[in-house]
């Protein structure tokens, strides 16, 4: 969370950004809020990126102005125009690429004053893991798969019954490059699992942490997955 202040004569407004992460090949959002101003035509929003000449995006007088937009962002950005009057200057980014990572500045000018705040945008790939019982194995085993990760993550197993146990000796993890030659599919197999236990497969890189849980009993298999972006707030 970054809060910036700006001074315009005697006036300053608070601009707030949130460190966020983009999943390559998908839509991303660069979050920025400011003190609302009901006079839409008096609001100017400028998004800038460190190291890039020209603007990422500009919105003024109630509409987009792309006359100074850098070519790498052409056709890839939009503000949430209907939410600008309530103080939302967040930017929607199409087809996030690794090269979109960096420091962005959200600059705001309204009839109340002006202000800006920086935002650190990380890019990579992250996805939910799915755990299944591998009945093909000679002994009962679990297979944890997640289709897209970058940079290469670490994978660890845990169990409710054997808390603190190290499963690295009884698991095997592989990383398979996907067709676009950037992201990788993560596959981890845990051997010699026991019934009536809950196992967790944890995948983590510097952008995200994902956990898949599976509870295997005689009568049913229960699964749960969650994904958490790191350093977002």
């Amino acid at each position: 969370l970054i809060i910036g202040f700006g001074i315009s004569g005697k006036h300053f407004i608070t601009v707030t950004t949130f460190t966020s992460a983009g999943n390559i090949g998908e839509d991303g959002t660069l979050s920025c809020t400011f003190e609302p101003d009901i006079k839409l035509n008096g609001i100017v929003i400028q998004w800038l990126k460190e190291g890039i000449k020209g603007l990422v995006h500009e919105f003024k007088e109630g509409k987009d102005d792309l006359s100074q937009q850098h070519e790498m962002f052409r056709g890839r950005t939009a503000v949430f125009a209907d939410q600008v009057v309530v103080g939302n200057a967040s930017l929607r980014l199409k087809n996030v690429q690794l090269t979109d990572a960096g420091t962005y500045t959200c600059y705001i000018r309204t009839s109340k004053g002006k202000g800006n705040a920086n935002l650190e945008y990380k890019t990579g790939a992250f996805s939910m893991p799915e755990i299944n019982v591998d009945y093909n194995a000679s002994s009962e085993s679990l297979r944890c798969e997640a289709p897209r990760w970058f940079p290469q993550p670490t994978v660890a197993w845990a169990s409710q019954v054997d808390q603190g146990a190290n499963f690295s000796e009884v698991s095997n993890t592989s990383f398979e490059l996907n067709s676009e030659n950037v992201t990788m599919k993560v596959v981890s197999v845990l051997y010699n699992v026991t019934i009536n236990n809950t196992y967790s497969c944890m995948i983590e890189n510097d952008i995200a942490k994902a956990t898949g849980d599976i509870k295997v009993t005689d009568s049913e298999v229960k699964r749960r997955s969650q994904l958490q972006l790191l350093n977002s707030g």
Epitope: I24, E26, K63, L66, G75, R76, A81, K94, S179, T183
Partner: antibody
Framework: EVQLVQSGAEVKKPGASVKVSCKAS????????IGWVRQAPGQGLEWIGD????????NYNEKFKGRVTITRDTSTSTAYLELSSLRSEDTAVYYC??????????????WGQGTLVTVSS | DIQMTQSPSSLSASVGDRVTITCKAS??????VAWYQQKPGKAPKLLIY???TLQPGVPSRFSGSGSGRDYTLTISSLQPEDFATYYC?????????FGQGTKVEIK
């Protein structure tokens, strides 16, 4: 309500040029990309290119580069497709379409009625 | 440039059938795949965008899925008004590209 109204059918001779218009209403013309797509008789859809009326920025299918020009007139909220050096295989229905997402180039969500261009000697 | 290979080119089905149409992208990964329905003499109609988001007003029997290079349009229970030609569109790249189309006919 978003509406795209295209100009009428055209018959042209090989080697000539054609200019098709697409008049937009029901939204802020300068805020949304407009694309052009064609469909030859009994064939599939083929993307030609698009324009951002707010700045005049264009993207073109490599297949048509050098022969196609997409322009706009913001005073009349009209986009134009001009295709030169016409040949018989350019005979098709030409559609204009608005791209969703305003300055973000999205999928084509509203379409014109189509303009039949016939190239015949 | 990303090309989209659509299959099958045509299929015959009955009312109530489940129908699946696929598109394969020539490269890369992005979720920017849309699906259109077109009837003879009419402009295409947007059904689904961003792989799986249903366009407002489109019946819920239409659904989209996919990841990586493979994308699918499913009609869960074919209705009489669904007999038409369907196209996928890749719109994540700078240059857009349609699939060749799939004609859904009455068996």
């Amino acid at each position: 309500e978003v509406q795209l109204v295209q100009s009428g059918a055209e018959v042209k001779k090989p080697g000539a040029s054609v200019k098709v218009s697409c008049k937009a209403s029901g939204y802020t013309f300068t805020s949304y990309w407009i694309g052009w797509v064609r469909q030859a008789p009994g064939q599939g859809l083929e993307w030609i290119g698009d324009i951002y009326p707010g700045g005049g920025y264009t993207n073109y299918n490599e297949k048509f580069k050098g022969r196609v020009t997409i322009t706009r007139d913001t005073s009349t909220s009209t986009a134009y497709l001009e295709l030169s050096s016409l040949r018989s295989e350019d005979t098709a229905v030409y559609y204009c379409a608005r791209l969703a997402g305003s300055s973000y180039r999205g999928a084509m969500d509203s379409w014109g009625q189509g303009t039949l261009v016939t190239v015949s000697s | 440039d990303i090309q989209m290979t659509q299959s099958p080119s045509s299929l015959s089905a009955s009312v109530g059938d489940r129908v699946t149409i696929t598109c394969k992208a020539s490269q890369g990964f992005n979720k920017y795949v849309a699906w259109y329905q077109q009837k003879p003499g009419k402009a295409p109609k947007l059904l689904i965008y961003y792989t799986s988001t249903l366009q407002p007003g489109v019946p819920s029997r239409f659904s989209g899925s996919g990841s990586g290079r493979d994308y699918t349009l499913t009609i869960s229970s074919l209705q009489p008004e669904d007999f038409a030609t369907y196209y996928c569109l890749q719109y994540g790249d700078l240059l857009y590209a349609f699939g060749q189309g799939t004609k859904v006919e009455i068996k």
